[in-house]
Amino acid sequence: RQQWELQGDRRCQSQLERANLRPCEQHLMQKIQRDEDSYGRDPYSPSQDPYSPSPYDRRGAGSSQHQERCCNELNEFENNQRCMCEALQQIMENQSDRLQGRQQEQQFKRELRNLPQQCGLRAPQRCDLEVESGGRDRY
């Protein structure tokens, strides 16, 4: 069993290294920013965020493109629930410093949790997304 675990670890690690999770991050950031816009923030106000979508993106086309690419990436983890969890954790971790305030963080987390389902994939069971912004140790 230990040998299998070790191989499983390595396989997941190399899957994660190969995966481009950036579209997922972009899709989620755009989604929560669109939600904020619908609550009255000026959609065209300048932003320092490199992921800040263009007005074109805000109409949804760019975002659906990101979602499609994101789902293609996540599909690689469909048969490895633990690795799917690690991928979601990585997305959370990568964005945790960019999220402004507790509310935005909760919103991002909520959207992240729904992501596998949006992609028609199984959500990983017992997956802890409570990542502190100090980073998580890799194995």
Partner: antibody
Framework: EVQLVESGGALVQPGGSLRLSCAAS????????MTWIRQAPGKGLEWVAN????????DYLDSVRGRFNISRDNAKSVLYLQMNTLSADDTGVYYC????????????????WGQGILVTVSS | QSVLTQPPSVSAAPGQKVTISCSGT????????VSWYQQLPGTAPKLLIF???KRPSGIPDRFSGSKSGSSATLGITGLQTGDEADYFC???????????FGGGTKLTVL
């Protein structure tokens, strides 16, 4: 008030069988994962088995897989543990517990415990 | 030997603070939620903390939980003699498809 009452514990010979029962009351049994946990005399806690709300998924400790069977009767609010080919290593107090695991993004936790029932395997 | 490592014993004086660590790996604590239990002598265990940091109703805020990477910690402040007990951490292990318990820590209030 949530209550979990175990029964069926006994002194049994190595190689023998035993069926533990756990009568649940005070909550909607069919909406919770349920779990058996055991504790050998003077030792720590050891998880034995989990069963999903509808009984469709079961997980077992490696050393009991193939020998033990966890099952439930939601109509009667009863949890069972059928134990076969028992050995001295299976001796201990067996606890019936309610497991708070709900969805993909929550964890296993045992928020209500029975009083425990003693199983002794000895010749 | 347990896969989750806890110190066998800790001790402190009444009113003091104590922490109990629980160390695991990426396949268990690193990915999954941790819970903590108190077992007073001769009784069934009682849930203290679930999902890393949450307290069930009725558990005083003297008890707290945290998690960082592949380790979790239970904190107890304002120690009382009634806190003398065994404390266990638990989590799911994704590789073993099993719940793991730590070996337990005996808390002595001096």
């Amino acid at each position: 008030e949530v209550q979990l009452v175990e029964s069926g514990g006994a002194l049994v010979q190595p190689g023998g069988s035993l069926r533990l029962s756990c009568a649940a009351s005070g909550f909607k049994f069919s909406t919770f994962y349920m779990t058996w946990i055991r504790q050998a005399p003077g030792k720590g806690l050891e998880w034995v088995a989990n069963i999903k709300q509808d009984g469709s998924e079961k997980d077992y400790l490696d050393s009991v897989r193939g020998r033990f069977n966890i099952s439930r009767d939601n109509a009667k609010s009863v949890l069972y543990l059928q134990m076969n080919t028992l050995s001295a290593d299976d001796t201990g107090v067996y606890y019936c517990t309610r497991n708070g695991l709900q969805d993909s993004y929550s964890g296993d936790f045992f928020d209500h415990w029975g009083q425990g029932i003693l199983v002794t395997v000895s010749s | 030997q347990s896969v989750l490592t806890q110190p066998p014993s800790v001790s402190a004086a009444p009113g003091q603070k104590v922490t109990i660590s629980c160390s695991g790996t990426g396949s268990n604590i690193g990915h999954n939620y941790v819970s903590w239990y108190q077992q007073l002598p001769g009784t069934a265990p009682k849930l203290l903390i679930f999902d890393n940091t949450k307290r069930p109703s009725g558990i005083p805020d003297r008890f707290s939980g945290s998690k960082s990477g592949s380790s979790a910690t239970l904190g107890i402040t304002g120690l009382q003699t009634g806190d003398e007990a065994d404390y266990f951490c638990a989590t799911w292990d994704a590789d073993l498809s099993a719940v793991l318990f730590g070996g337990g820590t005996k808390l002595t209030v001096l």
